[in-house]
């Protein structure tokens, strides 16, 4: 398939509740009606799939399988949120976008967003 540019932020810090959000923007060369978005995690040269979604332009994202991701779409932007993150999940999260209909199919892979996750300190015991 043909190449397409995908932009995403370089760094994001997850919240204390283990939630990280970032925008994945793609330069659509045509009038795609069906889009797939996959989030990949790269750590120690290993690449694993975090979640995947498919949607019709103008409709809500449908995340596939039991997903830790949620998101919304607006034009050529996808707002992604990953939940349940812990310190061990720190890594490079890559946004992959595929325009699946109509042909020609396009594929774009972002440079990745480094997500830092810091586990919150446990609350000290309180004497009341």
């Amino acid at each position: 398939c043909k190449a397409m540019h995908v932009a995403q932020p370089a760094v994001v810090l997850a919240s204390s509740r283990g939630i990280a959000s970032f925008v994945c923007e793609y330069a659509s060369p045509g009038k795609a009606t069906e889009v797939r978005v996959t989030v990949l995690r790269q750590a120690d040269s290993q690449v694993t799939e975090v979640c995947a979604a498919t949607y019709m332009m103008g409709n809500e994202l449908t995340f596939l399988d039991d997903s830790i991701c949620t998101g919304t779409s607006s034009g050529n932007q996808v707002n992604l949120t990953i939940q349940g993150l812990r310190a061990m999940d720190t890594g490079l999260y890559i946004c992959k976008v595929e325009l699946m209909y109509p042909p020609p199919y396009y594929l774009g892979i972002g440079n990745g967003t480094q997500i830092y996750v810091i586990d919150p300190e446990p609350c000290p015991d309180s004497d009341f």
């Epitope: 009606t33 069906e34 799939e49 995947a52 949607y55 399988d65 109509p102 020609p104 594929l107």
Partner: antibody, heavy 123, light 107 residues
Framework: QVQLVQSGAEVKKPGSSVKVSCKAS????????MHWVRQAPGQGLEWIGV????????TYNQKFKGRATLTADKSTSTAYMELSSLRSEDTAVYYC????????????????WGQGTLVTVSS | DIQMTQSPSSLSASVGDRVTITCRAS??????LAWYQQKPGKAPKLLVY???TLGDGVPSRFSGSGSGTDYTLTISSLQPEDFATYYC?????????FGGGTKVEIK
């Protein structure tokens, strides 16, 4: 009823080209992608590429890029697959098959197939 | 490219037997999978799409299941007309590759 009728068998010399046609009837030609798949004798199925008859948009399997050319004629509801620089390993049955209705998520299914066209490449 | 590994490559079974064919993808294909039946000299015929949805007019003895990378086609009670070769195909990322096929023969 939906029908995809392909052109007849061809015998070609190595280095030459072949053009296979696929005439669609029984549905709106521009509402469905047309895919091409081939099958060498006694072997499995191999996806060649896809064309959207409405827009002319095409995606090829990288393996065939530069050698395969897909076209579609809306006026006659006919799709074509041309393969150039033929070699003996291109001897196969070539199928056209339609996929899904326009713009329907999850409609990933090749539901109707042509009868196949045997292309024999031999010196 | 996503590799589709089908097993077994062939099997012998009797009429009435329960037959299971598996297809493993080299990465998660999220149920974007179809199964086809092919008889000698004929074009493939759609059996199942979206991993588990039966095609129009396909007998209910055929069923598809699975998720992620592992998928199964089951024939609950093999009939004489079911002796054929079966192929899986993914629709996740192009090229949309097929499995190598499973030939179901009469025992």
């Amino acid at each position: 009823q939906v029908q995809l009728v392909q052109s007849g068998a061809e015998v070609k010399k190595p280095g030459s080209s072949v053009k296979v046609s696929c005439k669609a009837s029984g549905y709106t030609f521009t509402d469905y992608e047309m895919h091409w798949v081939r099958q060498a004798p006694g072997q499995g199925l191999e996806w060649i590429g896809v064309i959207d008859p409405e827009t002319g948009g095409i995606t090829y399997n990288q393996k065939f890029k530069g050698r395969a050319t897909l076209t579609a004629d809306k006026s006659t509801s006919t799709a074509y697959m041309e393969l150039s620089s033929l070699r003996s390993e291109d001897t196969a049955v070539y199928y056209c098959t339609r996929r899904g209705a326009r713009a329907t998520v999850y409609n990933y299914v090749m539901d109707y197939w042509g009868q196949g066209t045997l292309v024999t490449v031999s010196s | 490219d996503i590799q589709m590994t089908q097993s077994p490559s062939s099997l012998s079974a009797s009429v009435g037997d329960r037959v299971t064919i598996t297809c493993r993808a080299s990465e998660n294909i999220h149920n974007y999978l179809a199964w086809y039946q092919q008889k000698p000299g004929k074009a493939p015929k759609l059996l199942v799409y979206n991993a588990k949805t039966l095609g129009d007019g396909v007998p209910s003895r055929f069923s598809g299941s699975g998720s992620g990378t592992d998928y199964t086609l089951t024939i609950s009670s093999l009939q004489p007309e079911d002796f054929a070769t079966y192929y899986c195909q993914h629709f996740w990322s192009t090229p949309w590759t097929f499995g190598g096929g499973t030939k179901v023969e009469i025992k």
